[in-house]
């Protein structure tokens, strides 16, 4: 990996043992200034592998609300607007980091957690041919 | 929102002002035990809107490596294996949280940051008709 020279103005950290506890400023900086995430908000409906978005809420997690995609069909929508079962709608998944309150119900103490979320769906050629 | 009763065993936090600084344990807990993320690892190739994955590395960020999807084609792959420009390959984007070292180069001090990443691609019916 890349070795970064330590900034002498860093906050002091006495405990060098793992599990490593760090200070995190929750005042979020948004780097998405030149891209509009809402631009893709209608893809769930216009896709040949459309999906619905389900709200997953957990007050012990930060962010507390995550939207999960569920593909609407097993197959994909063809040019006639019908479901073609010779193709498969599948979820595109991504591992994301969230903060889990630890100990539970603590406002200022968290643990990093990795969760797998479905972001949307794509249409793929099947590897198992259920439809002759 | 939901009010959570405070756990009396929480670490003490004197500073109640925003920007809020919290303690985060970086020993990641992985909740994806019953899901195999590699299951979807070939979708990028089998999709009708295939994509390539580009490595984005930043040592000042945690995680330092993020994979970005770039759609391979403007159109989508049809049943004959050709690119059909009457349909559009588009990126499915998601806002994710990462930790940015702040001040820079500090190993134990971070700020939450929201970034937009392309996770994969999907095939959509066009709204802008470039192809007659």
């Amino acid at each position: 990996g890349i070795t970064i020279p330590r900034n002498p103005g860093c906050p002091n950290s006495e405990d060098k043992n793992f599990p490593r506890t760090v200070m995190v400023n929750l005042n979020i900086h948004n780097r998405n200034t030149n891209t509009n995430p809402k631009r893709s908000s209608d893809y769930y409906n216009r896709s040949t592998s459309p999906w619905n978005l389900h709200r997953n809420e957990d007050p012990e997690r930060y962010p507390s609300v995550i939207w999960e995609a569920k593909c609407r069909h097993l197959g994909c929508i063809n040019a006639d607007g019908n479901v073609d079962y010779h193709m498969n709608s599948v979820p595109i998944q991504q591992e994301i980091l969230v903060l889990r309150r630890e100990p539970p119900h603590c406002p200022n103490s968290f643990r990093l957690e990795k969760i797998l979320v479905s972001v949307g769906c794509t249409c793929v050629t099947p590897i198992v041919h259920h439809v002759a | 929102g939901i009010t959570i009763p405070r756990n009396p065993g929480c670490p003490n936090s004197e500073d109640k002002n925003f920007p809020r600084t919290v303690m985060v344990n970086l020993n990641i807990h992985n909740r994806n035990t019953n899901t195999n993320p590699k299951r979807s690892s070939d979708y990028y190739n089998r999709s009708t809107s295939p994509w390539n994955l580009h490595r984005n590395e930043d040592p000042e960020r945690y995680p330092s490596v993020i994979w970005e999807a770039k759609c391979r084609h403007l159109g989508c792959i049809n049943a004959d294996g050709n690119v059909d420009y009457h349909m559009n390959s588009v990126p499915i984007q998601q806002e994710i949280l990462v930790l940015r070292r702040e001040p820079p180069h500090c190993p134990n001090s971070f700020r939450l940051e929201k970034i937009l990443v392309s996770v994969g691609c999907t095939c959509v019916t066009p709204i802008v008709h470039h192809v007659a």
Partner: nanobody, 123 residues
Framework: QVQLVESGGGLVQAGGSLNLSCVIS????????MGWFRQASGKEREFVAA????????VYADSVKGRFTMSRDNAKNTVYLQMNSLKPEDTAVYYC????????????????WGQGTQVTVSS
């Protein structure tokens, strides 16, 4: 911020040719496609052509199909527009830009343009 530098424009007679180039000064463009657009005096900016960085397939507006060819050089982060059989109605300022949503990109998705390069076709 991505920087776009277009060049290669000029004054040419009808039936002549020009080759425009556009250099993107960022390690990797944010999108997966690049486009050429043009804006004639007093008219709205319009799509001319687009190309995929990876696949290399290009798409053209009906008005330029068969006359213009778009290509790209990934190593140089540069795209080109070879314009043949030019017509007076091709007179415009030509711009290139990243297409973050490929063919789904609309003019509303842009908040930044380069300075463009003027193409003038005389009859």
């Amino acid at each position: 911020q991505v920087q776009l530098v277009e060049s290669g424009g000029g004054l040419v007679q009808a039936g002549g040719s020009l080759n425009l180039s556009c250099v993107i000064s960022r390690r990797t463009p944010s999108g997966y496609a690049m486009g050429w657009f043009r804006q004639a005096s007093g008219k709205e900016r319009e799509f001319v052509a687009a190309i995929s960085w990876i696949g290399g397939g290009a798409v053209y507006a009906d008005s330029v199909k068969g006359r213009f060819t778009m290509s790209r050089d990934n190593a140089k982060n540069t795209v080109y527009l070879q314009m043949n059989s030019l017509k007076p109605e091709d007179t415009a300022v030509y711009y290139c830009n990243d297409m973050p949503y490929g063919l789904d990109t609309t003019m509303d998705d842009y908040d930044y343009w380069g300075q463009g390069t003027q193409v003038t076709v005389s009859s």
